[in-house]
């Protein structure tokens, strides 16, 4: 005879999934806006800073009362892997002036991967589908001047300050609804 | 200096609808959550929802889904709460307040707009 | 909902002294580090103020002899020497969840 069977798989709790990843997020997103403060200290920024390659905001006006688990984790997915990619090329490429940054924009780095296993995980957990493997992006062009790594700079942490709050939102918001 | 200014008190009839305004100035109005919150008298403060200014993305305490509405003018820094199908127990003061991204804590209030319901 | 219950509903005090203040949550608001509490003190005819953030944060402009503290379900906020201009109410109120709800509030009276 084979092996005897493994203890029953003990379906998760899903509010407690979703409870661990809101605390991370939670989390990333105090470390953001701590770090997008201390860029506006060093470098204020003159207005809104946009950078084409970021993805648009999830949250529109009706969407969050529409939200559905599955849909919130694959776009919160998506988009937190651009962002991702984007600290990355902002260490990279950002020029001398944002090496003020570090290590706070490496910390950040670590934890924005750490969130996107946490993701991951979730996902798996819960059994939802599993996105299909992200086609090669194409590689971001650098900044052209030192003063465009601080306006993408500007844009990067704002928008993953955004991005955060949705997901902390929308998480919380169908944590009620399991 | 931060401030939160709302529109004036408001006399309605039972079944009506209000609107309320809260203008922003002094900060960057996309860079925090605009809030709402009721305090009905003898009653303890109770959250109606907020909204991203940003994105003008509203989330509501399920008790006041379907009734109230909230919206923003990001170009006026003004933020709107409508509260429709008013009744008795919708008499109030209505504070709109500036919440911490992601952590609904209210660091700036508005000074409040009196709400009475009345036949 | 998270329930906040504090005590005392009224507490009556003269200046100088000190007032320690209680919030009990119906469960748990803190996680990994973070405490979800907020207190917010109300003078008559004014909107609320807050105090302090995260249970223990102190906002920017508040007096020193504020503090907050706690994590669980039990927390405190103390005045460490009342001055003439702390009687008021003081409610609680937590974000661990969605939605936020505050304390039925303290009461504090010059005694």
């Known amino acids: 005879p084979g092996p005897p069977p493994g203890p029953p798989r003990v379906s998760p709790d899903p509010r407690a999934e979703l409870d661990s990843t809101v605390l991370l997020t939670r989390s990333l997103l105090a470390d953001t806006r701590q770090l997008a403060a201390q860029l506006r200290d060093k470098f204020p920024a003159d207005g809104d800073h946009n950078l084409d390659s970021l993805p648009t905001l999830a949250m529109s006006a009706g969407a969050l009362g529409a939200l559905q688990l599955p849909g919130v984790l694959t776009r919160l997915r998506a988009d937190l892997l651009s962002y991702l990619r984007h600290v990355q090329w902002l260490r990279r490429a950002g020029g001398s002036s944002l090496k003020t940054l570090e290590p706070e924009l490496g910390t950040l780095q670590a934890r924005l991967d750490r969130l996107l296993r946490r993701l991951q995980l979730l996902m798996s957990r819960l059994a939802l589908p599993q996105p299909p493997p992200d086609p090669p992006a194409p590689p971001l062009a650098p900044p052209s001047s030192a003063w465009g790594g601080i306006r993408a700079a500007h844009a990067i942490l704002g928008g993953l300050h955004l991005t955060l709050d949705w997901a902390v939102r929308g998480l919380l918001l169908l944590k009620t609804r399991l | 200096e931060v401030q939160l200014v709302q529109s004036g008190a408001e006399v309605k009839k039972p079944g009506a609808s209000v609107k309320i305004s809260c203008k922003a100035s002094?900060?960057?109005?996309?860079?925090?959550?605009m809030d709402w919150v009721k305090q009905a008298p003898g009653q303890r403060l109770e959250w109606i929802g907020d909204?991203?200014?940003?994105?003008?993305?509203?989330i509501y305490n399920q008790k006041f889904t379907g009734r109230a509405t909230l919206t923003v003018d990001k170009s006026a820094s003004t933020a709107y709460m409508e509260l429709s199908s008013l009744r008795s127990e919708d008499t109030a003061v209505y504070y709109c307040?500036?919440?911490?991204?992601?952590?609904?804590?209210?660091?700036?209030w508005g000074q409040g707009t009196t709400v009475t319901v009345s036949s | 909902d998270i329930v906040l219950t504090q005590s005392p509903a009224s507490l009556a005090l003269s200046p100088g002294e000190r007032a320690t203040l209680s919030c009990r949550a119906s469960?748990?608001?803190?996680?990994?580090?973070?405490?979800?509490i907020h207190w917010y003190q109300q003078k008559p005819g004014q909107a609320p103020r807050l105090l302090i953030y995260?249970?223990?944060n102190l906002d920017s402009g508040v007096p020193a002899r504020f503090s907050g503290s706690g994590s669980g379900t039990d927390f405190t906020l103390t005045i460490s020497s009342l001055e003439e201009e702390d009687f008021a109410t003081y409610y609680c109120?937590?974000?661990?969840?969605?939605?936020?709800?505050f304390g039925q509030g303290t009461k504090l009276e010059i005694k």
């Open positions: 307040a500036r919440g911490e991204l992601g952590h609904w804590y209210f660091d700036v």
């Open positions: 002094g900060y960057t109005f996309t860079d925090y959550n």
């Open positions: 909204i991203n200014p940003h994105s003008g993305g509203p």
């Open positions: 469960k748990s608001v803190s996680t990994s580090g973070y405490s979800y």
């Open positions: 995260l249970a223990s």
């Open positions: 109120q937590h974000s661990r969840d969605l939605p936020p709800t």
